[in-house]
């Protein structure tokens, strides 16, 4: 296939000219078939091309690699390992490529990889060592600082009989390789609970996105270690009330902003502490939008408008809210 132009415009790969050419070792800066390459922008885009494997002949200059909208299914160990290595690759986007299996060491030999997006893939089989590369109790630190895992939960009828949260957390915590992670996006994954270990062992996080999950409670989660946390997105979950322990932890974080809109807040006597805290805090930018969902008589009342006399525990709640 044709070498890339040095202009900033993308050059597409040409068809192979002859079988003799394709049999040669790949040129270091050629553009893979079905991809577009810009050496000036250090970018390769292989987008919506139904690729079934990661191209083997990626140019050594690639810094930004888009492999979105394909049919990759499996990322094997060393999926991006090349000779010479892709030493410049810093941003890798694999979203929407029908990946269901990411094996141990899939991202090994990418020394500069800072941002990885695996969103919108039904990851039924995410190896615990997908990011750490080995089963050592303490692995070499990963260079990753941003990991984007939005909507990686398989459809319900395709899920395996194990905890999806547990599988994801095992991969995030393996070998403590991701202790340098500053941004983690886990939106839209049907998470029912926030595993305690997750927050304790990712101390560098500045941005954590958990919106559009099914979190009912934060009682067992501790945010104390997240001293650098700046943004915590909890919109569109199933939160009913926040307890003093959680509120105190957030209060102790110097820079944090917490986003809580669109949760089914239960405005009964257990809500009194949260309401009092909301009225005082600067931590919740969207606090004026928070409204009661239950009991029925309180529906759509703004939390900031409530007085302690409004909050009683006489009302009968729906069964689904009592049991959680």
């Amino acid at each position: 296939s044709s070498p890339t132009s040095s202009a900033s415009s993308f050059s597409s790969s040409a068809p192979f000219l002859a079988s003799a050419v394709s049999a040669q070792p790949p040129l270091p800066d050629q553009c893979p078939a079905l991809c577009e390459c810009s050496e000036a922008a250090r970018t390769v885009k292989c987008v919506n091309r139904n690729l079934t494997e990661v191209p083997t002949d990626l140019p050594a200059y690639v810094r930004n690699l888009f492999l979105t909208g394909n049919q990759l299914a499996v990322l094997p160990a060393g999926a991006f390992a090349r000779r010479p290595p892709l030493a410049e690759l810093a941003a890798l986007n694999l979203s929407g490529s029908r990946l269901d299996e990411v094996r141990a060491g899939a991202f090994e030999h990418l020394p500069s990889l800072r941002q990885l997006d695996l969103s919108h893939n039904p990851l039924a089989d995410l190896s615990p060592f997908a990011f750490s590369g080995s089963n050592a109790s303490v692995s070499a630190p990963s260079p990753l600082v941003e990991l984007i895992l939005n909507h990686i939960v398989p459809p319900e009828d395709e899920r395996q009989n194990r905890s999806f949260e547990g599988m994801v957390v095992a991969a995030l915590l393996s070998g403590l390789a991701l202790r340098g992670l500053t941004r983690l996006e886990l939106a839209s994954n049907h998470f029912l609970f926030l595993p305690r270990d997750l927050l304790a062992q990712l101390p560098s996080l500045r941005y954590l996105d958990l919106r559009n999950n099914s979190l009912v409670s934060l009682t067992y989660a501790s945010f104390r270690n997240l001293t650098h946390l700046e943004s915590l997105h909890l919109e569109d979950n199933a939160l009913k009330v926040l307890h003093n322990s959680t509120l105190a932890e957030w209060h102790g974080l110097a820079h944090v902003k917490v986003f809580l809109d669109n949760n089914p807040w239960v405005c009964d006597c257990y809500m009194a502490d949260m309401v009092a805290w909301l009225k005082e805090t600067e931590v919740v930018p969207d606090k004026a939008r928070l409204t009661c969902a239950f009991p029925e008589k309180m529906r759509n009342r703004g939390l900031l408008d409530l007085n302690s006399s409004d909050l009683d525990c006489d009302a009968v709640l729906p069964q689904s809210l009592q049991t959680s």
């Epitope: 299914a73 029908r98 990946l99 398989p154």
Partner: nanobody
Framework: EVQLVESGGGEVQPGGSLRLSCAAS????????MAWFRQAPGKEREFVAA????????RYTESVKGRFTISRDNAKNTVYLQMSSLRAEDTAVYYC???????????????WGQGTLVTVKP
């Protein structure tokens, strides 16, 4: 082990269509990939198409792209091969296979059906 039973083969004119089915029983989801291979008289068995049970990723051999479509129905544990614009060279016994890998090699698949004959002739 996965048991595979193919159906839907038959005789069709060039340009015509057929839909093959492969019913999987036993533990079908223990195999991550389902594939169709074919073997013409006197030739080696060749890969045609594959699909993943989870996610539904698909892949095809070059000669059938745009003419054949592989799909799966997880609720029925069944995989389909919709074949259109059929040609004489598509005549073969079509085999359903199950395996773990996302590959095109015969050895990527551990469980096989008995095959169903597709004949394309005027």
């Amino acid at each position: 082990e996965v048991q595979l039973v193919e159906s839907g083969g038959g005789e069709v004119q060039p340009g015509g269509s057929l839909r093959l089915s492969c019913a999987a029983s036993g533990r079908p989801f223990s195999s991550k990939t389902m594939a169709w291979f074919r073997q013409a008289p006197g030739k080696e068995r060749e890969f045609v198409a594959a699909v993943r049970w989870i996610g539904g990723a698909t892949r095809y051999t070059e000669s059938v792209k745009g003419r054949f479509t592989i799909s799966r129905d997880n609720a029925k544990n069944t995989v389909y091969l919709q074949m259109s614009s059929l040609r004489a060279e598509d005549t073969a016994v079509y085999y359903c296979a199950a395996g773990q890998a996302w590959g095109t090699k015969f050895t990527d698949y551990s469980d096989w059906g008995q095959g169903t004959l597709v004949t394309v002739k005027p």
